[in-house]
């Protein structure tokens, strides 16, 4: 799309569940009619046309798909369609992974869940919500990132070695906050700044490790839009 013609962006982590939110403002008089509501979710992939599932041709339409700013887009297709009676249809390979919460739908929440989200799911999504006497829509762009934690130096460590853990997610903006923790038997224990732990943005520096430091270390990256990702790394320190 051209700059200045963007839909809201939703970030998700590859391999993790992703929620594509759609809770349009529904007039009070229509709330009682939500059981008859129908919703169709459409996906326009970022690149590489989706393979049409047999018996599920791509949605009809002109497919002009020639944006003002770049070449032809992959054809859009129906991810999931839920009719007034709860009758569902959609693209077969996606079916087991895509979900609409039935109770949510009756409250006016038509969010689509991808369990899990995959790289090919990136792109523009549109939901058309059909109520008894009006039609509403939701639009968003799903971007997928990869989360990783790296150790420098990598591999097993010896007592008194130093290590830097770097927590990252492939997203252009910086996280608003980074929280480090250790997984103990009783749950998560926050890692605080100390002579043994030096925190700097998404880095954690351990100047002198000991066998006590062996085990899972984690970080939580939180972004301004509320998206957060939790990443784990198993540290091995040899006695």
């Amino acid at each position: 799309l051209q700059p200045g013609a963007e839909v809201p962006v939703v970030w998700a982590q590859e391999g993790a569940p992703a929620q594509l939110p759609c809770s349009p403002t529904i007039p009070l008089q229509d709330l009682s009619l939500l059981r008859r509501a129908g919703v169709t979710w459409q996906h326009q992939p970022d690149s590489g046309p989706p393979a049409a599932a047999p018996g599920h041709p791509l949605a009809p339409g002109p497919h002009p798909a020639a944006p003002s700013s770049w070449g032809p887009r992959p054809r859009r297709y129906t991810v999931l369609s839920v009719g007034p009676g709860g009758l569902r249809s959609g693209r077969l390979p996606l079916q087991p992974r895509v979900q609409l919460d039935e109770r949510g739908r009756q409250r006016g929440d038509f969010s689509l869940w991808l369990r899990p989200a995959r790289r090919a799911d990136a792109g523009e999504y549109r939901a058309a919500v059909h109520l008894r006497d009006r039609a509403l829509s939701c639009r968003l762009r799903l971007r997928l990132g990869q989360a990783s934690m790296t150790a420098s130096p990598p591999g097993s460590l010896r007592a008194s070695d130093w290590v830097i853990l770097n927590c990252s997610f492939s997203r252009p903006d910086r996280p608003a906050s980074v929280h480090w923790f250790r997984n103990r038997g009783q749950g998560r224990v926050p890692v605080r700044e100390s002579p043994h732990h030096h925190l700097a943005e998404s880095f954690l520096f351990l100047p002198q490790v000991s066998p006590m430091d062996s085990g899972p270390w984690g970080c939580i990256l939180t972004y301004r839009d509320g998206f957060n990702v939790s990443i784990m790394y198993n540290l091995t320190v040899l006695g």
Epitope: A5, E6, P24, G61, A128, A135, L136, S137
Partner: antibody, heavy 120, light 107 residues
Amino acid sequence: QVQLVESGGGLVKPGGSLRLSCAASGFTFSSYAMSWVRQAPGKRLEWVAYVTSGGDYIYYADTVKGRFTISRDDAKNSLYLQMNSLRAEDTAMYYCTRVAYDYEWYFDVWGQGALVTVSS
Amino acid sequence: DIQMTQSPSSVSTSVGDRVTITCKASQDVTTAVAWYQQKPGKAPKLLIYSASYRYTGVPSRFSGSGSGTDFTFTISSVQPEDFATYYCQQHDSSPWTFGQGTKLEIK
């Protein structure tokens, strides 16, 4: 080629009725949502009525609700607009339009229009 | 209902000029705006949909941009056949509404 041809327009007295027809050709009519859009002389375009491809959902503009009825006959590749209790303000050119998708509500194909004049 | 307010209502221009028309929605419609061209005595023709996507066969001199409530339609170099009236339409939610139109006239 893709074509929509309206018929049934004409002069009618206030309170009278008229039925517009739209014959579709050059595309799979049953796969598309359809709509009627009108334009009073010298005025902006005004959406009037809409029907989904399967006919599950039908919507009307408040100005025509209860007086106009949209219907489709997929076997005949035809769209209809039954207009009852016509008023002077219903005077307009009525366009049969194809909706790009059931879920994307812009109008990608238009007929040439049928003129409806409501006058005593 | 979502109101669409177009400006200016008319614009006088010459062949080769760049022309910009704006459309303001009364509430957020994300990128659900289409632009149409209508010549006297003819039906409208779809030019742009979803704010910035050119419809099949539409020349590249026509472009659109915007999101939320503010949208722009541009003809980069006006041609003789472009003198017509242009309408914006929101295709976000029913009732689907149009702007009042902008008449492009020869200077």
